[in-house]
Interface confidence: medium
């Protein structure tokens, strides 16, 4: 196999008795993308099958990047906090038991949640085998896979790799379609010599050869053209150094009232369980750890506030103090862990010693192709479509990875609007109540009567406001029972939540201006009641009298307006989100400041940006019973995050507006908390850390779109597929490994 | 905490430009989120509101004193001043400046104040 | 303008009574009212903004009530160091105005 050269087979080449292309996933542990790069001319096996069939420059693995959760998460498709393997090592409080890898416990099905894609395949009449896989040996929903092997590491690749092949021999009714294939390396010799070491070069060609050997075997029964084959990893691998430790022992004066999970991904729970689990105080955990010192190498987290495209906080298991540490870093108890030096894993998955290497060939797919990267959840929804089966619900978008097959087998299309949109109308240019605001410039009935008459825009200025500021649609509301307007303006449109007496969404387009100066500072004395929307739907000026700590924050900036007399446009209550002090201070200089740079860079951007409401922290929009509970004596929800979408061309040299091509997104979504104790600015300018608290929390569309309800881009003329990938597109601004 | 301390001149003279300085400490004039304000009493009389200024720069004045009356601000040293033209016997009074907070757009109380400084306009 | 009219004009009151003044606009001026007092030879003092919420370090026997039109600045216990003059004031609309006052006398 390995001396031909690479086979261009438009159809599948399978022999008598294979009617469907088999599947077969290989995991090879820890293999991180770079050594695809480095180390390809010790690799020819692999090296071939990467030049002859697709690759992705990496696959990103899910957070924390560790072996069971990302085995499990490739094979059904959902995030660790959906299908229950939170990391290798756990505590269950309703189960009442402890999970890891060296106990009996891990094969309790009570600990996996989730459909493996074994148990989808032999569901719809296909068999499947596993030659090792998290889970296969686990009797989930009370099934196994129809052939599974218990884990044993010590068995030869070479015999794992025979074992398959006779299992490729079997006679048709009893022949799989599904395969996986485990090896260990070259984790075990990452962990043990680091990344670059002399184990990890020796491990690379041993797999290599047993790689070789199955190609070698799939050639000399003419499969070698009808298996379609996905190599991947789980995750990458990092050095760790016993000079890059920070212990908990440095943080508190005693630390036996709690149990830390320690390492890369460490998490803080109760010593004492399953008594203490629920009083145990974890926001003065939070409290004790933020910003102890200046070059402190690990951020506190209670789970919610992680990043959001992380999706690590939706499960029992997942214990709320999270240490989100640096690379090559670990965080431990006490100098009595050392536990250190060699490599390690389960660090943030967007840094680029975590990414993890994904090869696909066979006749299902493009030859010969480097695709962009992309996550692990996307894999299941793409094996079931090389086995032709319906996929279960799960975390990936499915028909996302389009581009990867010759043919694709499901055609994604844009979802149906469920929610109608109506349009709020201009009545009358006086407003009927004040709402308790402000406007001293516009001191009689005149003035004010010819401010409100720009908000009633005609037909061709609806037009062109809509072209400029709604280059790719407007966002299509895919939440039930919502009633909202759209309110179009000149220099922006907003699609109004009548319940929630706020904008769902704000939308604008920032040209690249010569000027990149920062914005000037908005109107400050002025705020009137929109005539368009009834006074009952409206937020009061007078609700933020109340709170010391919530003021009123602009959805989109009066300052982007550069004549005062078009701020007013923006000066209006259809305008205000409810934001706390300190959070108001990072969205006012990103927009300021920030904003006017990326346009500057990008030929222009359009802006999307509104409020997200996840009290529940599931990763989903709250049903409206969800935030009624959090109201607490306002008529005004706060928000629990606020995201802003940028989006321009691809193509630099056109604005967004005239964008023929492919899009280039930049979206964040910003947990809206009442201090800024995340980014330790006590003492800096915003300069300092406004722009890398923004980066900490960028996130893909898909993560907008699932936390708002919103569906972006239904008019941008492009194939839903492609649509897709950059819905699932995450923006890495990582360099080093 | 923020203190307001006026200086200027105790006695003018008729026609003549009364000048008054409020210096602000403990606090930015800049910072946003609050006007600056100047009131005036007449003897054993009530409060009159002159005028109030912003950091950026736009002020309110009351109509009453409005062609005779400036206020500016000058954030480098931290002061906001009072200019009040062609004055008479009438405007002899105390003269204090305040700070108002701004909540949503709407002007509060005015929380602190100057401790006042007597203008007489006499010749 | 806006004209606010307060009521009484003068009070003698006894300590531990309870004083009420009232402070009328001649129109809606929602809840941007405020109430001040002031002790001869000092500058005023804010007690209550916006109508009825209480400035940080005011003694809690000053509570304040009202929005559109009508105000009342309420003194639970009146004690001795309350003797002042009271003031209110509207912040809705330009020009701000004031109050005549209420000035309140201990017997």
């Known amino acids: 196999w390995l001396e031909e050269n690479c086979d261009t087979a438009q159809q599948s080449q399978c022999p008598e008795g294979f009617d469907l292309p088999p599947v077969i996933l290989f995991s090879m542990d820890g293999f991180r993308a770079e050594y695809l790069y480095t180390w390809d001319t010790l690799m020819p096996n692999i090296n071939k099958l990467k030049t002859c069939g697709i690759h992705s420059k990496y696959m990103r693995a899910m957070y924390p990047t560790k072996t069971f959760p990302n085995h499990y998460t490739i094979v059904t498709g959902l995030y660790p906090e959906s299908h229950g393997i939170i990391d290798n090592n756990m505590y269950d409080v309703n189960l009442n038991k402890n999970f890891s890898l060296s106990s009996k416990e891990q094969n309790n099905p009570a600990w996996w949640h989730g459909q493996p894609m074994w148990l989808t395949a032999m569901y719809q009449g296909l068999k499947a085998a596993t030659y090792f896989w998290p889970g296969s040996e686990v009797a989930i929903n009370g099934s196994f896979p129809s052939i599974y092997m218990p884990y044993n590491g010590s068995v030869p690749f070479e015999e794992r790799i025979s074992t398959l092949l006779k299992w490729l021999d079997l006679p048709k009714a009893e022949r799989p379609r599904f395969y996986t294939m485990y090896f260990e390396e070259p984790d075990s010799s990452g962990h043990a010599g680091g990344p670059v070491s002399a184990r990890v070069i020796k491990a690379l060609q041993v797999v290599d050869h047993a790689f070789g050997m199955l190609m070698e075997g799939l050639k000399q029964r003419n499969l070698h053209n009808c298996v379609n084959i996905i190599l991947l990893a789980d995750h990458g691998m990092d050095q760790t150094y016993c000079n890059k430790m920070e212990y908990m022992t440095d943080y508190f004066p005693r630390i036996n009232f709690f149990y830390m999970y320690e390492g890369p991904a460490p998490r803080i729970r109760a010593h004492n369980i399953p008594h203490d689990f629920f009083s145990f105080n974890s926001e003065e955990i939070v409290r004790n750890l933020s910003c102890r010192k200046p070059d402190q190498h690990f951020k506190p987290y209670l789970t919610p506030d992680l990043p959001k495209r992380l999706h690590y906080a939706k499960n029992v298991r997942i214990d709320k103090v999270h240490l989100f540490v640096d690379q090559q870093w670990l965080a431990v108890r006490s100098k009595s862990n050392t536990n250190c030096g060699g490599g390690n894993h389960g660090y943030n998955n967007e840094f680029r010693s975590m990414e993890a290497i994904f090869l696909a060939h066979g006749p299902s797919f493009k030859e010969k192709t480097e695709v962009e990267p992309f996550e692990n959840i996307e894999v299941y929804n793409l094996m079931c479509d090389l086995l032709r089966i319906q996929p279960a619900p799960n975390n990936g978008t499915h028909g996302s990875l389009n581009h990867l097959l010759k043919v694709p087998f499901y055609e994604p299309s844009h979802a149906e609007e469920v929610s109608k949109f109506s349009v709020c109308g201009f009545a009358n240019p006086l407003p009927t109540e004040s709402l308790d605001c402000f406007c001293p410039h516009l001191q009689n009935s005149t003035q004010l009567e010819q401010v409100n008459q720009m908000l009633n825009l005609t037909q061709e200025e609806i037009t062109a406001t809509v072209k400029v500021n709604l280059p790719f649609g407007r966002p299509r509301v895919l939440q039930k029972n919502v009633d909202h307007c759209l309110l179009y303006h000149r220099e922006y449109v907003s699609g109004f939540g009548k319940a929630m007496r706020m904008p769902m969404w704000s939308s604008y387009t920032v040209p690249q201006l010569g000027d990149t100066s920062p914005l000037p500072p908005t109107v400050p004395d002025c705020l009137r009641a929109d005539v368009r929307v009834p006074p009952s739907e409206s937020q009061k000026c007078s609700f933020y009298l109340a709170d010391k700590n919530i003021t009123h924050g602009f959805l989109y900036p009066p300052a982007s307006n550069r004549t005062s007399d078009s701020q007013y446009d923006a000066l209006i209550t259809s305008n205000l989100v409810p934001m706390y002090e300190e959070f108001r201070k990072m969205w006012d200089y990103f927009h300021s400041v920030l904003l006017i740079k990326h346009a500057t860079e990008r030929n222009g951007v359009n802006v999307v940006s509104g409020p997200i409401f996840d009290y529940n922290y599931d990763g989903h929009f709250d049903a409206p019973d969800e935030i009624t509970k959090h109201l607490a004596n306002t008529d005004v929800p706060i928000p629990t995050h606020y995201f802003v979408v940028l989006t321009s061309c691809k193509n630099k040299s056109h604005t967004p507006e005239n964008c023929p091509g492919w899009l280039d997104v930049l979206p964040f979504i910003i947990p809206h908390r009442p201090t800024n104790v995340e980014s330790c600015p006590e003492g800096k300018p915003e300069a300092l850390w406004v722009e890398e608290r923004f980066t900490a929390h960028i996130a893909r569309v898909r993560d907008v779109e699932l936390l708002t309800g919103l569906d972006f881009y239904q008019d941008k003329v492009q194939p839903v597929s492609e649509i897709l990938q950059l819905k699932t597109y995450l923006p890495t601004f990582e360099t080093t490994i | 905490q923020v203190q307001l301390q006026e200086s200027g001149p105790g006695l003018v003279k008729p026609s003549q430009t009364l000048s008054l300085t409020c210096t602000v400490s403990?606090?930015?004039?800049?910072?946003?989120?609050?006007?600056w304000s100047w009131i005036r009493q007449h003897p054993g009389k009530g409060l009159e509101w002159i005028g109030i200024?912003?950091?950026?720069?736009?002020?309110y004045y009351n109509p009453s004193l409005k062609s005779r009356v400036t206020i500016s601000v000058d954030t480098s040293k931290n002061q906001f001043s009072l200019k009040l033209n062609s004055v008479t016997a009438a405007d002899t009074a105390v003269f204090y400046c305040?700070?108002?907070?701004?909540?949503?757009?709407?002007?509060?109380?005015?929380?602190?104040w100057g401790q006042g400084t007597t203008v007489t306009v006499s010749s | 303008e806006i004209v606010l009219t307060q009521s009484p004009d003068f009070q003698s009151v006894t300590p531990k009574e309870k004083v009420t003044i009232t402070c009328r606009a001649s129109?809606?001026?929602?809840?941007?009212l405020h109430w001040y007092q002031q002790k001869p030879d000092q500058s005023p003092k804010l007690l209550i903004k916006?109508?009825?919420q209480s400035f940080s370090g005011v003694p809690s026997r000053f509570s304040g009530s009202g929005s559109g039109t009508d105000f009342t600045l309420t003194i639970n216990s009146l004690e001795a160091e309350d003797a002042a003059t009271y003031y209110c004031?509207?912040?809705?609309?330009?020009?701000?105005?004031f109050g005549q006052g209420t000035k309140v006398e201990i017997k």
């Open positions: 305040a700070r108002v907070a701004i909540v949503t757009t709407i002007p509060g109380g005015m929380d602190v």
């Open positions: 403990g606090g930015s004039i800049s910072s946003g989120g609050y006007y």
């Open positions: 200024i912003y950091y950026s720069g736009s002020t």
């Open positions: 129109q809606s001026i929602g809840i941007s």
């Open positions: 916006y109508a009825s």
């Open positions: 004031h509207q912040s809705r609309s330009f020009p701000w105005t």
